[in-house]
């Protein structure tokens, strides 16, 4: 049940009043306003939008709205020396060149400053060589090539299709395989839904459309030149050779028309199986090199982008809490886009804007939340989550002591089928309870709750009658708050019915065709899905900021810890002989999980019974809830990933977008059969079990009675 207990409250100033104030028409207007020109990070246009948002948030009634600027490493194409890829003949003549830009969508032909497709942070270079097709360039794809097909990528240019995993992982894998360049392309199998027309006649990717994106492997570092510390006026910056996460080989993205021209000539080996074939009319041969008459032709990349230290601007708005002003609930989403940002990020930014307006309206009527709410419009998310990370680095001491929760607000939609939620287990019950109170926007579910339509369309694989809630991974601005600082976090958006294509994004992702019209014509003409997402995000913020007792249920953490322990144990048990030889035991972990379960259960009982009118006891219980997520943080971080410090969750080492549970143990076990020193490898498994067991036990003890 929603709460309305803040000071100066009148009965109407409760969750319902907040939700009723949210209007689809406003979200639509804001989206239009935010998408008329590009807002690339580090540009004047994006600075102007920051100032506009600052001004409007002030008008909406926030207590203060400040710009927080940082000077971070960004990457841009050379305006006079464009990037492209060519096929060259034996004389070195270019007989085919890829396109230099995407054909602009109707109505946008005269817009200036559309950045051409590029892979941000690619080094400069003009490598030439034979092509190898590497499927999605996942770890398992390179295993297939190297170990099974005996294809050596060393000194080759590889071509990989976008999808399945974060593009930075693809580039890292290619580098490790010895490639000297990477071409990324969008295959229609992943970015062209059957039965739907290409933009502007539908929401599919045209052949000339290209996905932009950064190719960093930052592992949570933020600005590559100032890892761990804010990129402020007196920052000490690393030299470019010591920068974190930069790729070492040239990378460039292309569309499927251009990819066809490269792939149709491929020779060498046939693809190993159907999972390597896309939807183009090409054989999907792996190579290396071209076939028959074309075998003397090579591929050459021409990459001239530059890395530049550039100023970025976050907008930080504050709505001071009436009772616990030193407890922060944060709603944040980014503002910078690759081009127009019709979905990413402005469908999210428009929702945040309307949430701020609604909170501001209540505040103007005399209401305040119990706890402080911080609103953030992050910059340079597309360049590696830089704005959010730098701000969190600058404010880490405050955040680790005062941070209650972080709710992320990037794209509100990636489809219009059902809700998608990723969050800490602490928020499961909050999300369930909230969605039971909200109306479903879905056709066929009129008069039914959002919970009901969500559960029907996206059922939990473990618990019948409940919806799927996924683990937090990364690739968005919650990363620093959750993975580094241990602040309970969550995200929600409307998604597609496309489980098999979970990490490929929607077809027009990061292309010039991600416009206002894309959303208004094809995804959400009534803006009803945007409104629902605003209600979910805003409702979560409202409850987190306003409920007397924090709406966290530690028992749900106990349940998932057992599930994750079972899962990692079963992975390890694929090596029964080695476990015996090296005396590998999971007893300590299972014991810690059992203790956590019992202590969490007792804590929940006390939570029902304690005297809520005693502010000291209330604060004490709430602090135990707030600091539970923090208790899963290991100050030493994960091996080789010091900014991923959460012991229960981390972004997968093979796909930044995906979350992995017990990541330390998982990575120690991964491919262990190929390790040259098995004794050392299994020793690391044992060490990681020890770290995990200790952390779970230590977290459990934070929930014990304090004395």
């Amino acid at each position: 049940k929603s709460s309305n207990e803040a000071t100066n409250i009148t009965p109407k100033h409760n969750m319902k009043a907040f939700l009723d104030e949210l209007k689809a028409e406003n979200i639509k207007k804001f989206l239009y306003n935010f998408t008329q020109i590009p807002h690339l990070a580090g540009t004047e246009q994006n600075f102007q939008l920051a100032k506009q948002i600052q001004s409007q948030w002030k008008e909406f009634g926030l207590d203060s709205v400040e710009l927080a600027h940082y000077d971070v490493l960004l990457s841009y194409p050379n305006k006079t020396h464009p990037n492209y890829i060519s096929i060259i003949n034996e004389d070195g003549n270019e007989i085919f060149n890829t396109s230099l830009f995407e054909p602009p969508p109707p109505g946008y032909e005269n817009v200036s400053d559309i950045v051409p497709p590029f892979s941000a942070f690619s080094p400069q270079g003009m490598p030439e060589g034979d092509l190898v097709y590497v499927n999605y360039a996942r770890t398992e794809d390179f295993f297939k090539l190297e170990r099974d097909m005996k294809i050596n990528c060393s000194g080759k240019i590889v071509i990989a299709r976008y999808g399945k995993v974060f593009r930075g992982n693809k580039v890292k894998n290619a580098q490790l395989a010895g490639a000297k360049g990477v071409i990324l392309y969008s295959d229609p199998a992943d970015y062209f839904a059957p039965g739907v027309k290409s933009y502007p006649d539908g929401w599919n990717l045209p052949g000339g459309g290209v996905q932009r994106g950064n190719i960093l492997n930052l592992n949570g570092a933020g600005d590559p030149l100032t890892p761990g510390y804010p990129a402020n006026e007196y920052a000490y910056r690393r030299g470019i050779a010591e920068a974190v996460g930069l790729p070492s080989i040239p990378v460039h993205p292309i569309g499927y028309y251009d990819a066809q021209k490269l792939l149709e000539k491929m020779g060498g080996s046939a693809p190993p199986d159907s999972s390597w074939r896309g939807s183009l009319k090409v054989p999907y041969n792996v190579g290396p090199g071209f076939t028959g008459n074309f075998s003397t032709q090579k591929v050459k990349m021409h990459i001239h982008s530059t890395n530049e230290v550039t100023r970025i601007y976050n907008v930080i708005g504050t709505l001071r809490g009436a009772v616990e002003p030193d407890r922060y609930v944060i709603l944040g989403g980014h503002r910078d886009s690759w081009v127009f940002g019709g979905i990413d990020p402005q469908s999210g930014a428009a929702v945040v804007h309307e949430i701020v307006r609604s909170f501001g309206t209540l505040k103007k009527e005399g209401w305040r939340p119990r706890r402080t709410i911080l609103f953030a419009s992050w910059d340079a998310e597309e360049f590696g989550l830089l704005g959010s990370t730098e701000w969190a680095e600058e404010n880490s001491r405050l955040l680790q002591e005062r941070g209650v929760a972080y709710i992320n607000a990037d794209s509100s939609i990636e489809g219009n089928y059902t809700l998608r939620v990723d969050c800490t287990p602490l928020m499961y019950s909050l999300v369930h309870n909230l969605t039971k109170e909200l109306k479903s926007p879905d056709e066929g579910f009129e008069g039914k709750s959002l919970y009901e339509s969500w559960t029907k369309k996206s059922p939990s694989p473990e618990f019948s009658g409940m919806p799927r809630i996924s683990k937090l991974g990364s690739g968005n601005d919650f990363e620093v708050f959750f993975q580094r600082l241990g602040i309970a976090s969550g995200r929600a958006r409307y998604t597609k019915n496309w489980e098999t294509n979970k990490f490929s994004g929607y077809p027009l992702y990061h292309s010039v065709y991600e416009t206002y019209e894309l959303v208004e014509k094809f995804y959400d003409p009534m803006f009803k899905y945007h409104l629902t997402v605003a209600q979910v995000r805003g409702g979560m913020v409202f409850e987190l900021a306003n409920s007397i007792v924090l709406p966290f249920d530690c028992r749900d953490y106990a349940v998932v810890l057992r599930k994750y322990a079972d899962k990692i144990y079963s992975i390890s048990m694929k090596h029964p002989q080695e476990m015996k030889t090296y005396s590998v035991s999971f007893d300590s972990l299972f014991s810690a999980v059992k203790n956590f379960t019992e202590i969490a259960s007792k804590f929940s009982e006390r939570l029902q019974d304690f005297d809520k009118s005693n502010p000291i006891v209330l604060r004490m219980m709430n602090d135990q809830l707030m600091f539970l997520e923090r208790a899963f943080i290991d100050p030493l971080g994960l091996p080789d990933r010091p900014f991923y410090r959460h012991v229960i969750y981390a972004p997968s080492s093979h796909n930044k977008y995906a979350g992995e549970s017990f990541p330390g143990i998982y990575d120690a076990l991964f491919d262990i059969e190929s390790k040259v020193d098995p004794s050392k490898a299994w020793g690391e498994v044992k060490r990681q079990i020890y770290v995990a067991a200790f952390t779970v036990q230590a977290a459990a003890e934070t929930l014990s009675e304090v004395a």
């Epitope: 398992e140 099974d148 080996s269 190993p272 999972s275 390597w276 028959g292």
Partner: antibody, heavy 115, light 107 residues
Framework: EVQLVQSGAEVKKPGASVKVSCKTS????????IHWVRQAPGQSLEWMGN????????TYNQKFQGRVTITVDKSTSTAYMELSSLRSEDTAVYYC????????WGQGTLVTVSS | DIVMTQSPDSLAVSLGERATLSCRAS??????VDWYQQKPDQSPKLLIY???TRHTGVPDRFTGSGSGTDFTLTISSLQAEDVAVYFC?????????FGAGTKVEIK
């Protein structure tokens, strides 16, 4: 040491189906392609199809027009080949082979189709 | 389908002498050709992949060469244990296809 152990000989009537198993050991099952090949008495080798045990991706020889189905059971590191609508000309030794280059072979399973 | 034509059908060579086996593809297959050895009543064994790379444990008297459409397997000094049927195979395009085999005997 890599080993592929196939199920025993089968005698089937025309029109029936046969399912041959191939239990693997000594390597990481999901890493190597599994192919199925047959060899009629005194004849050459004929490729039937393959599977990626990691994700179940398959490719079949069109000649077998949907008569062949290749599957895997990751939990037991076993591959299966089922051939339906058997005819006398399907009498052959059926081999599984692990590795894209057919690096390791099973001992073969003789399938006799006779009325 | 790509047809792999092997010649000769059979070959008799004296112990210690060179044996040269040929394989021709009906269209360009690059270097995506493998060679297999099948001894009587045994399963085939991989000898050569990528036209010229010896598989682990294969004696260095076995050499593969060629690209495009013409491929050769050479046994530089025939040993008694080399008596077998040798198959070439292309894996440049589906369906993967084998040659009819060359039978190597001792003269």
């Amino acid at each position: 040491e890599v080993q592929l152990v196939q199920s025993g000989a089968e005698v089937k009537k025309p029109g029936a189906s046969v399912k041959v198993s191939c239990k693997t050991s000594g390597y990481t099952f999901t890493e190597y392609t599994i192919h199925w090949v047959r060899q009629a008495p005194g004849q050459s080798l004929e490729w039937m199809g393959n599977i990626n045990p990691n994700n179940g991706g398959t490719t079949y020889n069109q000649k077998f027009q949907g008569r062949v189905t290749i599957t895997v059971d990751k939990s037991t590191s076993t591959a299966y080949m089922e051939l339906s609508s058997l005819r006398s000309e399907d009498t052959a030794v059926y081999y599984c082979a692990a590795g894209w280059n057919f690096d390791y072979w099973g001992q073969g399973t003789l399938v006799t189709v006779s009325s | 389908d790509i047809v792999m034509t092997q010649s000769p059908d059979s070959l008799a060579v004296s112990l210690g002498e060179r044996a040269t086996l040929s394989c021709r593809a009906s269209q360009d297959v690059g270097t995506a050709v493998d060679w297999y050895q099948q001894k009587p009543d045994q399963s085939p064994k991989l000898l050569i992949y990528w036209a010229s790379t010896r598989h682990t444990g294969v004696p260095d008297r076995f050499t593969g060469s060629g690209s495009g459409t013409d491929f050769t397997l050479t046994i530089s000094s025939l040993q008694a244990e080399d008596v077998a049927v040798y198959f070439c195979q292309q894996r440049n395009s589906y369906p993967l296809t084998f040659g009819a085999g060359t039978k190597v005997e001792i003269k």
